[in-house]
């Protein structure tokens, strides 16, 4: 039930990786707004995003607080010209959001090959440490810092010359690999949540090669 | 719950080819590494190769490189293993496993395969 | 390639005793090992991963230890139903490699 000139959300979806975390909403507003509260199942409610005509609602300063609790949101919906109108049974329509652990579920992003270095017959390949949302004493924490050994990166490298692929992997964000010498090797990562039993894998990060434009070694 | 059933083994003579299929259910492939492992008569494991199949990459034990082919379908929840030019010593038990990056919790029961002229 | 020794390839003992296989890398696997009991005509089951951690619903009598190339597996008191062939596996490079197997027996 509800007013005769809104209509309540529906769709409400979580966009999140590496913890920068969006709900997303239907429909886009005709004559209403919206305004989305969050809380986690033992907390108090929080409005954000207020009287807004915006199907999202970046709720990444709430769900960093603690990503290890599971939020709920819900989506109220109000008459454009008279947001203290409310429905049927006294209070605005709104609908609640699928539940949500930031630690469980958020997408792994990208991740990218920081750096590559031989000497000799091995090659020491780094896998930037992205910076999060995450805080703790008032410092971002990098995604190692809040994963852990919960998160690994496994390596794809092969022979430029070759289509034969060799992997390895590392619960550090450092790759020590032997190679042979006077060939060039591209390199690809991935990172996994061995825990998880969904969103455990990241898209590959971009390849890189040796002996290309880039250098051996890269900051 | 979490199942692998292997199947299309049987009896092969040496030189022709043959596909194994491995049935996933409780699960999605594509969230996974997956692999196959062999194990010949009297004999111990050996590793075959695995499969992203999220996105195709595979990577193999040199020497099944070129006859041996990991593939996947993941609409079908499938892993497959082509196994050309086959010879007497790849008489085996082929089991299909799920890895989670720090282990392989998953098996399935095996499938055996016996080249015989 | 990462050679896996293991050893011995076949143990006799009795109900009681305490039971060790090592596995010997030829280079650092970085405690990227497993331990697997197989039994005749079935899969192989995890016992032992990340070198050290205890699969889940696994007695507490196995245990693993070991870092570098050196690992070692115990059964601190062997029970009849453990009789079965024992493998460790490196899974920190490819190609990922098996042990050679220990066959236990009871005496």
């Known amino acids: 039930s509800g007013t005769t000139n809104t209509v309540a959300a529906y769709n409400l979806t979580w966009k999140s990786t590496n913890f920068k975390t969006i709900l997303e909403w239907e429909p886009k507003p005709v004559n209403q707004v919206y305004t989305v509260q969050i809380s986690t199942k033992s907390g108090d409610w929080k409005s954000k995003c207020f009287y807004t005509t915006d199907t999202e609602c970046d709720l990444t300063d709430e769900i960093v607080k603690d990503v290890k609790q599971t939020y709920l949101a819900r989506v109220f919906s109000y008459p454009a010209g008279n947001v203290e109108s409310t429905g049927s049974a006294g209070e605005p329509l709104y609908e609640n959001s699928p539940e949500f652990t930031p630690y469980l579920e958020t997408n792994l992003g990208q991740p990218t090959i920081q750096s590559f270095e031989q000497v000799g017959t091995k090659v020491n390949v780094t896998v930037e440490d992205e910076r999060t949302l995450v805080r703790k004493n008032g410092t971002f924490l990098t995604l190692r810092q809040v994963f852990g050994k919960d998160l690994i990166y496994t390596l794809y490298y092969w022979k430029s010359s070759s289509s034969g692929k060799k992997t390895a992997k590392t619960n550090t964000n450092e790759f020590l690999i032997d190679v042979d010498k006077g060939e060039n090797y591209c390199f690809s990562v991935q990172a996994v949540i061995p825990s998880r039993t969904v969103n455990r894998k990241s898209t590959d990060s971009p390849v890189e090669c040796m002996g290309q434009e880039k250098g051996e070694f890269r900051e | 719950q979490v199942q692998l059933v292997e199947s299309g083994g049987g009896v092969v003579q040496p030189g022709r080819s043959l596909r194994l299929s491995c049935k996933a259910s409780g699960f999605n492939i594509k969230d996974y590494y997956m692999h196959w492992v062999r194990q010949a008569p009297g004999k111990g494991l050996e590793w075959i190769g695995l499969?992203?199949?999220?996105?195709?990459?595979?990577i193999y034990d040199p020497k099944f490189q070129g006859r041996f082919t990991i593939s996947a379908d993941n609409s079908k929840n499938t892993l497959f293993l082509q196994m050309d030019s086959l010879r007497p010593e790849d008489t085996a038990v082929y089991y299909c496993?799920?890895?989670?990056?720090?282990?392989?919790?998953?098996w399935g029961q095996g499938t055996p395969v016996t080249v015989s002229s | 390639d990462i050679q896996m020794t293991q050893s011995p390839s076949s143990l006799s003992a009795s109900v009681g005793d305490r039971v060790t296989i090592t596995c010997k890398a030829s280079?650092?696997?970085?405690?990227?090992l497993n331990w697997y009991q197989q039994k005749p005509g079935k899969a192989p089951k995890l016992l032992i991963y990340?070198?050290?951690s205890l699969a889940d619903g696994v007695p507490s009598r196995f245990s693993g230890s070991g870092s570098g190339t050196d690992y070692t597996f115990t059964i601190s008191s062997l029970q009849p139903e453990d009789i079965a062939t024992y493998y460790c596996?490196?899974?920190?490079?490819?190609?990922?490699?098996f042990g050679q197997g220990t066959k236990l027996e009871i005496t």
């Open positions: 280079q650092d696997i970085r405690k990227y």
């Open positions: 496993a799920r890895d989670n990056s720090y282990y392989f919790d998953y």
């Open positions: 990340y070198a050290t």
């Open positions: 499969i992203d199949p999220e996105n195709g990459n595979t």
């Open positions: 596996l490196q899974h920190g490079e490819s190609p990922y490699t």
